[in-house]
Every structure is written in structure tokens, then in C-alpha cells.
Interface confidence: low
């Protein structure tokens, strides 16, 4: 079955700092969205192998990628308090599959000691239920996507 492993569950960074979020996917995959959850979920990036990544204006110039779409590490730089939130990986496949989420806490230097990450993945209010399909960006159907060559056949 298709699944997305996402790590870490929680990370704390100072204002101006950086965080890494890793999305690992098994099975057939067309691409990866990183979405910031909340009342109005926002797409942060879309990444697809051999494709120019799309980055939300708010994060342009602050995002780096390493790895490939099935094992992608997204680095967010120059963090601001407004970047605090839960970020989830969304695998674009026949159906939409979500990672467990990463809670990113961006703190002022003086309040760093007040914040702790537990070992458990974010749940409940920290990780809203993935938005309904109608709230998702329209995605091409599988039949509309080019057939992807196997990894060994990739140039």
C-alpha cells in the first residue's frame, strides 16, 4: 500500500534558523507537495524529479531540496515566527496520501528553553485532518500524466 513516512515529528528552530523535513514514499509517485496545515491549508512547494520545483511566494529563496521525489529532504531557511505550524507531505499518486506531519516551532532566542518536542507524531489539534478533496489543488488524473520510466531507465 502507498504510504508516506515523514520526519521529524517535531522540530524547534530559532528565528532566522533552518529546519529539514524529509518525505519518504513507497510505491508509484508523480510528485510531492509540502503543505502547511491550518484553517486555510497552503501549498509550500511542489517537487517532481527532473522538474522545476514550484515554491510559494512566501518561501521563495528560502527553500532547498536534496534527494529525489521518493526520498526528498526539504530545507526551509530564514525562519520567521509566522512559519510556525504543521507541515505535511502529500504524495501525488492515484489517490492523495499524506505524511504524519511535522510540527515546526519557530521561537525567539529568549524563549527557546520553554519549548519542547515530544516523541509522538503531532496529533489532534496539532495535525488537522487533511483537507477535503475539494480543497486540494486540481491534479491531473493518472491517465493524463506521462508514463514514468523506471528508475533504471531515467537519464
Amino acid at each position: 500500500a502507498q504510504e508516506v513516512q515523514q520526519s521529524p515529528h517535531c522540530t524547534i528552530a530559532p528565528v532566522g534558523g533552518s529546519v529539514n523535513i524529509t518525505c519518504s514514499t513507497s510505491g508509484e509517485l508523480h510528485g510531492i507537495y509540502l503543505r502547511q496545515l491550518g484553517p486555510q491549508p497552503q501549498n509550500i512547494i511542489y517537487y517532481e524529479d527532473r522538474v522545476v520545483p514550484t515554491t510559494d511566494k512566501r518561501f521563495q529563496g528560502r527553500i532547498d531540496f536534496s534527494g529525489s521525489q521518493d526520498n526528498l529532504t526539504i530545507t526551509m531557511h530564514h525562519l520567521q515566527p509566522s512559519d510556525t505550524g504543521t507541515y505535511t507531505c502529500q504524495a501525488v499518486t492515484e489517490i492523495n496520501v499524506y505524511g504524519s506531519g511535522t510540527l515546526v516551532l519557530v521561537t525567539e532566542e529568549q524563549s527557546q528553553g520553554l519549548h519542547r518536542c515530544s516523541d509522538a507524531p503531532p496529533t489532534g489539534s496539532a495535525l488537522p485532518v487533511p483537507p477535503t478533496t475539494s480543497a486540494l489543488p486540481a491534479l491531473p488524473t493518472a491517465s493524463a500524466l506521462p508514463a514514468l520510466p523506471t528508475a533504471s531507465a531515467l537519464p
Epitope: N43, R50, V51, V52, D64, A138, P155
Partner: antibody, heavy 129, light 107 residues
Framework: EVQLVESGGGLVKPGGSLRLSCAAS????????MSWVRQAPGKGLEWVGR??????????DYAAPVKGRFIISRDDSIKALYLQMNSLKTEDTAVYYC????????????????????WGQGTTVTVSS | DIQMTQSPSSLSASVGDRVAITCRTS??????LNWYQQKPGKAPKPLIY???SLQSGVPSRFSGSGSGTDFTLTISTLHPEDFATYYC?????????FGGGTKVEIK
């Protein structure tokens, strides 16, 4: 306007060297894979090689006839692509085009659409004694 | 390397004709195939990507079909500006390879 402009072509003797440049504008050059394609007089198109974007390792691939003689490089800070041609042969005579790699695909939040490959106007390289 | 066999190498047609150009590959490339149009002294112009998707700004009289090893570029109604040379290209594996071209001439 999305544009690629090649320069550096000219007449060179067999065994000589030449460096072609390609200046990009109007698009995010640093995230593009870039290729060189050539066309000998009266002949078809021949892929020369390509360079990936830095986030994909910036690695290069070459066609067999030029491997070991040609070197593709890029300078993202000035949106420039280069083709260093060494040990030139008469059969390297051609118009050389700089292009965005045809695998380059832009996506937005609502759809997935391919940006039309961008091609320069070409620069002519003549290898003759 | 993947070999690209384009046919015919040239054809004569009249304005208003329907024209079909075929491209056969030496191995399965799924739909990783592009079509280009080139006029004398000009750079190639992308027409079709992923075998059947029309590039932005290309007239709808151009269409592409096929998958696997057999592909076709069709011009439903030939216009005067369509007289040119057409190339297919596979982007499935390195080295990227082009077909030999099909020159569409005025009858």
C-alpha cells in the same frame, strides 16, 4: 521575454579549441537543466550533451562523438551556459543551439504543464584548415 | 542508444491536405517523445511533448499520438506556414536522440 542567446562561434582549425557561451534571460536559469544541440550543414539535429541543475548535482551527460572532447558548464550567478570544445574535428562543423532541456517541466498549484523548450538562435562553428 | 526512424523523409502536399508523419523507436519509450518544426535558418520550434500534448501557442491543427514505439504527428489541414522540416526526439534515455527529419514541401 524568455530568451537564450549564443555567442562564440567562428572559424577554427582542426585540433583547435573554441568556447561557446549562452546567455539566458526571462526564466529561472538556476533550476533548469540545459542542453546543447547541433546541426551540421544540410543535416538533422544532433544532441550534444546537457548539464543538470545544481540541486540535481550539476552533473553532465554527453553524446558519444563529443565525449572527452567537449565540456559543458554553467554559471548560475550570471545565467550563463558554456560549451568548451577541444580537439575539434571537421565533423564538428555545425550550428550549435543552446536549449532548455526538454525534460524541464514547470508546475503550478492547479496544473502540470510543460514549458515549451527554449532555443537560442544558434551560433555557427566551422572547423576547417 | 535508442534509434529513431522517421518516415517519410520527405513528402509533397498541398494547402488544405491532411499530413501524417511517423516516428518509430528501437525500444519502448512510453510517451517520452517530442515533435519539433524547423524552418530554414531558424531554430527548431517545439510542437508536441509527451507524445500527444500540444505546446502552448501551437495551433490545434497539430496533434500527436502513439505510445511505446510508434508515434504519429498529424497536421489536420495544412497551412502555408506549415511547410517545414519536422523532427521527433526521444527524451526517455541518454543520449537523447532525434529522428532524421521529414521535409514537408509544397506540391
Amino acid at each position: 521575454e524568455v530568451q537564450l542567446v549564443e555567442s562564440g562561434g567562428g572559424l577554427v582549425k582542426p585540433g583547435g579549441s573554441l568556447r561557446l557561451s549562452c546567455a539566458a534571460s526571462g526564466f529561472s536559469f538556476s533550476v533548469a537543466w540545459m542542453s546543447w544541440v547541433r546541426q551540421a550543414p544540410g543535416k538533422g539535429l544532433e544532441w550534444v550533451g546537457r548539464i543538470k541543475r545544481k540541486t540535481d548535482g550539476g552533473t553532465t551527460d554527453y553524446a558519444a562523438p563529443v565525449k572527452g572532447r567537449f565540456i559543458i558548464s554553467r554559471d548560475d550567478s550570471i545565467k550563463a551556459l558554456y560549451l568548451q570544445m577541444n580537439s575539434l574535428k571537421t565533423e564538428d562543423t555545425a550550428v550549435y543551439y543552446c536549449t532548455t532541456d526538454p525534460l524541464l517541466r514547470y508546475s503550478d498549484w492547479l496544473s502540470h504543464s510543460l514549458m515549451g523548450d527554449v532555443w537560442g538562435q544558434g551560433t555557427t562553428v566551422t572547423v576547417s584548415s | 542508444d535508442i534509434q529513431m526512424t522517421q518516415s517519410p523523409s520527405s513528402l509533397s502536399a498541398s494547402v488544405g491536405d491532411r499530413v501524417a508523419i511517423t516516428c518509430r523507436t528501437s525500444q519502448n519509450i512510453n510517451n517520452y517523445l517530442n515533435w519539433y518544426q524547423q524552418k530554414p535558418g531558424k531554430a527548431p520550434k517545439p510542437l508536441i511533448y509527451a507524445a500527444s500534448s500540444l505546446q502552448s501557442g501551437v495551433p490545434s491543427r497539430f496533434s500527436g499520438s502513439g505510445s511505446g514505439t510508434d508515434f504519429t504527428l498529424t497536421i489536420s489541414t495544412l497551412h502555408p506556414e506549415d511547410f517545414a522540416t519536422y523532427y521527433c526526439q526521444q527524451t526517455y534515455s541518454i543520449p537523447l536522440t532525434f529522428g532524421g527529419g521529414t521535409k514537408v514541401e509544397i506540391k
